[in-house]
């Protein structure tokens, strides 16, 4: 079954093709399901999901997060500002998704699927955005050194970083989905 498609939908050839918004919605839900599977492995493997020491690792990370000023919440909603924030945030998450690639044993393919599906999602959203000039792309050199730094952490910090990336990415996508459903 293709990413974001239900087998029920595939079996119904007479159905209307998906609109751009429906395609984006399904793509995000597909990625979220993938994150859910990765989180299961992470939480089963270590006690990171219950840890109270998250702040220690969070200092090393600058994970994208929605805030009131981004225009994605019900109060102060602004479609254009919000769309820019969603795309910019997803681009910033890419380096962290790259970091996740060698962090899973039984869910290696799932981690790759999340990464590739996010790239596709960014393309979908860029087609939807009117103001592409406002979107800042992360610097590749900065990303490379960040990746090296993350990979050099001790085992405990790497486990915690994995947990925090998954949790933050899930939250960012959930916020994005709620916002996109207002557009």
């Amino acid at each position: 079954v293709p990413p974001g498609e239900d087998s029920k939908d595939v079996a119904a050839p007479h159905r209307q093709p998906l609109t751009s918004s429906e395609r984006i919605d399904k793509q995000i839900r597909y990625i979220l399901d993938g994150i859910s599977a990765l989180r299961k492995e992470t939480c089963n493997k270590s006690n990171m999901c219950e840890s109270s020491k998250e702040a220690l690792a969070e200092n090393n990370l600058n994970l994208p997060k929605m805030a009131e000023k981004d225009g994605c919440f019900q109060s102060g909603f602004n479609e254009e500002t919000c769309l820019v924030k969603i795309i910019t945030g997803l681009l910033e998450f890419e380096v962290y998704l790259e970091y996740l690639q060698n962090r899973f044993e039984s869910s290696e393919e799932q981690a790759r699927a999340v990464q590739m599906s996010t790239k596709v999602l960014i393309q979908f959203l860029q087609k939807k955005a009117k103001n592409l000039d406002a979107i800042t792309t992360p610097d590749p050199t900065t990303n490379a050194s960040l990746l090296t730094k993350l990979q050099a952490q001790n085992q405990w910090l790497q486990d915690m970083t994995t947990h925090l990336i998954l949790r933050s990415f899930k939250e960012f996508l959930q916020s994005s989905l709620r916002a996109l459903r207002q557009m």
């Epitope: 919605d25 839900r29 996508l173 959930q174 916020s175 459903r181 207002q182």
Partner: antibody, heavy 117, light 108 residues
């Protein structure tokens, strides 16, 4: 578990704050909701507060109801109360094992608010 | 918003009851069902249209897609006498109520 408190008899126009307290888990990791039920009536959704700190309210609740959260409590602030606001107020926890789906898997017993002159 | 039918239904012990819920727009299977007994808070029965919540009997079955959803209770028991509510989890913006109006199930 969850427990609501703060429900009482108030006169119309009086503001009131209800508090929902969690035991055994931290609220910061969960989406939370307030729902009310007038005597003999159905469930009426008031609003959600999500883990990203955003709040969403039912159309009728906007401006008069406000939800805020700490790691152990969720508050519902209500203003300009009228007799129509008489109800049992429930707080409920959203589940996180599936990535997107606002289902409510744990409810408090509710607290009764009576608005009468 | 969510339209639930019927408002009340009477069913014989061992019988089958069907409750319908209609959304005003497609909710992509993000639908839950709750059971509420007098003096108690609601209890989650089914989520994501058809997944049974922990500890819920397999006599409860959820189905549907798009805007139309159904809860079926088979082999009805006395303990099933309650009010049942559907709830959409798809959208929390510009809605009056995420819950349906409720269906009272009376067991004869």
């Amino acid at each position: 578990s969850l427990e609501e408190s703060g429900g009482r008899l108030v006169t119309p126009g009086t503001p009131l704050t209800l508090t929902c307290t969690a035991s055994g888990f931290s609220l910061s990791s969960y989406d939370m909701s307030w729902v009310r039920q007038a005597p003999g009536k159905g469930l009426e959704w008031i609003g959600y507060i999500y883990t990203d700190t955003s709040t969403y309210y039912a159309n009728w609740a906007k401006g008069r109801f406000s939800i805020s959260k700490t790691s152990t409590t969720v508050d519902l602030k209500m203003t300009s109360l009228t007799a129509e606001d008489t109800a049992t107020y429930f707080c409920a926890k959203g589940s996180t094992d599936y990535a997107f789906d606002t289902r409510l898997d744990l409810w408090g017993p509710g607290t009764l608010v009576t608005v009468s002159s | 918003d969510m339209t639930q039918t019927p408002a009340s239904v009477e069913v014989a012990m061992g019988g089958t009851v069907t409750i319908k819920c209609q959304a005003s727009q497609s909710i992509s299977n993000e639908l839950s069902w709750y059971q509420q007994k007098p003096g108690q808070p609601p209890k989650l029965l089914i989520y994501r249209t058809s997944t049974l919540a922990s500890g819920v009997s397999s006599r409860f079955k959820g189905s549907g897609s798009g805007t139309e959803y159904t809860l079926t209770i088979s082999g009805v028991e006395c303990a099933d006498a309650a009010t049942y509510y559907c709830q959409q989890g798809y959208n929390s913006n510009d809605v009056d109520n995420v819950f349906g109006g409720g269906t009272e199930v009376v067991v004869k």
